[in-house]
Interface confidence: low
């Protein structure tokens, strides 16, 4: 029998120029007699241009929604009925071809066209565009607070807030033809639940999202976005009702930068430059398309690609990459943002060199990319150390850490955390290496203390790069490095002349001079540790909190011993700066630090000095006894200390913890306590430290009390940051 | 509103001090920095320091350390400035103003001018 | 100490002209400026902080703008109230400096 063609509406998005009509201010304001009689005649020119072609027969509805510069663009919709079975033959590309030819046929000639009797339509300037009903739907519920701007090159121009009478607003950009616009959202509340999405073209099609941002972002208190070209559309949603805006927008035109390079690298092993997106740390514009050729200077190098909080992953070929696609070697792989470093090492086989390309494949697009680019030994990629395969880094073997995702770095050890002599493979404990007593059978514990070895997971890096064999050998009275550089930076982790943390005692003037409270509005919050003359460290988490996230509210108090009084060797300072770990996780408790940079130095007194900082190397064996600071809690829910309080904790192999915690526990951590519980950190000892004194007498910082399962109880033990962990950071920061 | 009020003029002699004050209103006191400018009579401005009324906490400009102390009633929600060992480099005014580390200082006292003469 | 350099010193305008001052700070005050115009035996004006959001009640005419290291007051189209000492203060950092100020004058 007779089957009814099923009909699909397709929806399409577009704008045109109109050669022979000037745009005005009138024509921004949709209330203007302006904007109503240039609409209805522009509408009319749409659809008898649309009717023009077979296209015609097709027809629906259209809507001109705005204008914009450029003599004059008008942007539109229209929806066409098509059999479903012709929906992929009319594509936008064939429906603005069609539309195209349609005008080209009526340039010269001297009949009467109906769409011509007004409008000169530009069939250069005619841009067709796949939408959808939602996308109408969108662009509809913005109409009542819709604002158009031209922005001139040069110009930086602040848009006018949302009108919060509405639920949404839609800015519609435009700028000169050949340049890219380049919008800036700063959040300027510490709170709000708003939405502002941006668009690759002049309504909110969903196809041509570049991001969306939600809520006022503390991790992005800044976002900038570039768009392929000279046309956005911003859309606002409202979220909590307020006042005040939440946030501030600007625009402004920026000419297209080349991401093209060539590149020869020098024969050495470290980094040796940058390669980025185009306004770095902008998120990089739908479209962008980098091309980076590395030449290598021999086939014993292979080059090396260092990632910041991204990583490169292999995608099956059909799914498109949504955060960037890159090729390599003809490899293709997708970026994923991550709160990790990464590292993709590239085998090289020929002196041609490498090509690398990065795509934005979709419109949606994310912040900018840097990678640091050099070589690796193709023979020994990691020296002293183990390469791990999931993340390209170079990690410690055999220390007691699973620093590898996949734990690799921690099997087939012979000696664990532990020292292998040579002669028989017996494994001795590390501080009885290089101690002036032979331990091993034919004392190769004791050789090469006093020369340059091969960098290991255990060796001393000096300043020169060369590493020495006796284990933590900072600022123990002896210089082991040829440049004396174990003995540098050493005026730290001295007590004071010395005359509760649960299960703790209480701490006498002087006997902690690194313990650090910080406080708000007189109220101590957080722990935290002395460790230069301007800065103190302790837990990112203490700032967890929007509301304390300002350095305005933070006071330090250093020399501190009673909550309640103060003491002639007291002082306080205001916080400068306060920066989080790029890397930390609230969930997670990873890369729980953070730094406050204090608003003067200090001076150095009886009361105030710095603890020392351990090299990335230094080894501290489970089974040591340190000690924990701070005023928090003395039982699990009670009130905060009024005394400094001092306790005593065993580290924790750390696969015996991690299975306490399920697993949880990562690189970063390191664990404390006993089985049995009793003695603990506390609420209130948050980012204060975890001191282990080592057999020169001075004071080394192992750990920031981080998280852990109440206080004190049997079976669990406290959680820290592990300062090897994040010791590169801290140093990159503080020097 | 927010209002700062600081009496309008200070005489004192060579060698002497002087404590001017400054009486906040209209928002917590507490909470908010207290900061205080001189300006010499066609100069620019220049920082003596801030303090922090929640917790008394000072911070000044080292070129005021000697010269400047600051406290704070809390009670009163009143601010003082004293300056010692007065010269004629002294003689300025003086403004206060409530501090925040995003706006700095969006209100004004309406300054105390201090004229130090024999 | 952050060092702001201001410019020009002085300067005269015509009513409705578009006058701009500018700012350098001697390392990047990550936007922490703040604009203030000041009348003959006055206090300061607050007009603008965070490098470019303007105070309630001061003319959309006025604006801020700048980034890193360098900044700028525009004031769009001169009026006879903008008369006035105008300076900025960078509050990135203690101890807080100001700059030395800008004269504008009627022409």
């Known amino acids: 029998g007779y089957k009814a063609e099923v009909m699909v509406s397709q929806v399409y998005s577009g704008s045109l120029r109109v050669l022979n009509r000037h745009f005005s201010q009138d024509l921004t304001r949709r209330e203007s007699s302006a904007f109503r009689s240039e609409t209805a005649k522009a509408q009319k020119m749409l659809k008898e241009l649309i009717t023009s072609t077979r296209l015609g027969t097709y027809y629906n509805s259209s809507s001109v929604y705005s204008f914009g510069e450029g003599p004059l663009t008008c942007f539109f919709w229209f929806i066409l009925q098509i059999p479903e079975h012709r929906r992929l033959m009319l594509s936008p590309e064939v429906v603005q071809a069609l539309l195209v030819e349609e005008l080209l046929s009526t340039v010269n000639s001297s009949a009467a066209v109906p769409y011509r009797a007004e409008y000169e339509v530009d069939p250069e300037g005619l841009v067709i565009l796949e939408a959808s009903v939602k996308d109408i739907a969108a662009l509809n519920s913005t109409l009542g607070c819709y604002r158009y701007s031209y922005v001139g090159q040069g110009q930086v121009l602040r848009l006018k807030g949302p009108d919060h009478l509405a639920s949404s607003c839609l800015w519609h950009l435009q700028g000169p033809k050949d340049l890219m616009l380049k919008l800036r959202l700063e959040w300027t509340l510490a709170e709000c639940r708003d939405r502002l999405a941006m668009y690759d073209v002049a309504g909110p099609l969903e196809k041509r999202l570049i991001t969306s941002v939600y809520g006022c972002s503390r991790q992005e208190p800044v976002v900038e976005v570039l768009a392929s070209g000279a046309i956005m559309a911003v859309v606002w949603k409202k979220g909590l009702h307020s006042y005040y805006d939440p946030f501030v927008l600007s625009v402004q035109p920026v000419v297209f930068q080349a991401c093209e390079v060539n590149l020869t690298l020098d024969n050495r092993l470290d980094s040796q430059g940058v390669l980025s997106t185009p306004y770095f740390p902008s998120y990089y514009s739908p479209q962008t398309h980098c091309s980076w050729h590395l030449t290598v200077p021999s086939l014993d190098y292979g080059l090396a690609l260092w990632f910041d909080a991204y990583a490169l992953r292999r995608q099956k070929y059909d799914l498109p990459c949504t955060q960037g696609q890159w090729t390599i070697q003809n490899r293709r792989l997708c970026g994923l943002r991550i709160l990790q470093p990464y590292a993709e090492r590239i085998p090289v086989v020929a002196t041609a060199g490498i090509t690398i390309n990065f795509t934005s494949q979709i419109s949606l697009t994310g912040p900018g990319v840097r990678v640091h680019y050099g070589l690796y030994n193709q023979s020994d990629p990691c020296p002293g150390e183990f390469l791990c395969s999931v993340n390209g880094l170079c990690v410690p073997a055999c220390d007691g850490v699973k620093d590898c995702p996949n734990g690799l770095d921690e099997r087939n050890c012979v000696c664990r955390a532990t020292f292998q002599c040579k002669e028989d493979s017996t494994c001795i404990s590390l501080p009885k290496v290089c101690d002036g007593q032979p331990d091993c059978l034919n004392g190769s514990d004791e050789e090469q203390c006093q020369e340059g070895v091969p960098c290991g997971t255990f060796t001393f890096q000096c300043e020169d790069r060369s590493c020495v064999k006796k284990p933590n050998p900072q600022c123990d009275g002896r210089p082991d490095c040829r440049d004396g550089s174990d003995e540098e930076h050493c005026d730290c982790g001295l007590q004071g002349p010395s005359s509760r943390i649960v299960g703790g005692a209480v701490s006498s003037e002087g006997e902690w001079p690194w313990q650090a409270s910080l406080q708000v509005r007189g109220r101590h919050i957080c722990g935290g540790a002395l460790i230069a003359d301007r800065w103190v460290i302790t837990a990112a988490h203490c700032f967890q909190e929007d509301s304390m996230a300002s350095t305005v509210l933070w006071t330090v108090f250093l020399g501190k011993v009673w909550q309640n009084s103060r003491w002639p060797g007291e002082v306080s300072f205001k916080v400068s700066r306060l920066l989080l770990h790029p890397y930390h996780e609230e969930d997670s408790h990873d890369y729980d630090v953070a730094l406050l940079q204090l608003d003067h130095p200090v001076v150095r007194s009886a009361a105030v000095r710095p603890v020392c900082l351990p090299a990335r190397s230094h080894f501290f064996e489970p089974g040591l006894h340190c000690w924990i600071t701070g005023w928090g809690a003395l039982r699990e829910g009670g009130p905060i200390s009024n005394a400094l309080q001092k306790v005593d904790v065993q580290l924790i192999p750390q696969d015996l913890c991690s299975e306490v915690y399920r697993y949880q526990v990562t690189p970063r951590m390191l664990c404390a306590g006993y089985r049995k519980g009793k003695k603990d950190a506390c609420q209130g000892d948050s980012g204060g430290p975890l001191v282990c004194k080592a057999l020169s007498g001075r004071w080394f910082l192992a750990g920031l009390v981080s998280w852990g399962l109440g206080c004190g109880r049997p079976n669990y033990f406290g959680v820290y940051t592990r300062i090897t962990g994040v010791i590169s950071w801290i140093q990159q920061v503080v020097t | 509103q927010v209002q700062l009020q600081q009496p309008g003029a200070e005489l004192a002699k060579p060698g002497a001090s002087v404590k001017m004050s400054c009486k906040a209103s209209?928002?917590?006191?507490?909470?908010?920095?207290i900061t205080w400018v001189k300006q010499r009579p066609g100069q620019d401005l220049e920082w003596i320091g801030n303090?922090?009324?929640?917790?008394?906490?000072?911070y000044y400009n080292e070129k005021f350390k000697s010269k400047a102390t600051l406290t704070v009633d809390t009670s009163s929600r009143t601010a003082y400035m004293q300056l010692s060992s007065l010269t004629s480099a002294d003689s300025a005014v003086y403004y206060c103003?409530?501090?925040?580390?995003?706006?700095?200082?969006?209100?004004w006292g309406q300054g105390t001018s201090v004229t130090v003469s024999s | 100490d952050i060092k702001m350099t201001q410019s020009p010193s002085s300067m005269y305008a015509s009513l409705g002209e578009r006058v701009t001052i500018t700012c350098k700070a001697s390392?990047?005050?990550?936007?922490?400026l703040s604009w203030f115009q000041q009348k003959p035996g006055k206090s300061p004006k607050t007009l603008i902080y965070?490098?470019?959001r303007l105070v309630d009640g001061v003319p959309s005419r006025v604006s801020g703008s700048g980034s890193g290291q360098d900044y700028s007051l525009t004031i769009s189209s001169l009026e006879y109230e903008d008369v006035g000492i105008y300076f900025c203060?960078?509050?990135?950092?203690?101890?807080?400096?100001f700059g030395a100020g800008t004269k504008l004058e009627l022409k």
């Open positions: 103003a409530p501090y925040d580390s995003d706006y700095a200082m969006d209100y």
């Open positions: 209209g928002y917590t006191f507490t909470s908010y920095w």
């Open positions: 303090i922090y009324p929640g917790s008394g906490s000072t």
């Open positions: 390392q990047d005050i990550n936007n922490y």
């Open positions: 965070r490098a470019n």
């Open positions: 203060l960078q509050y990135d950092e203690f101890p807080l400096t």
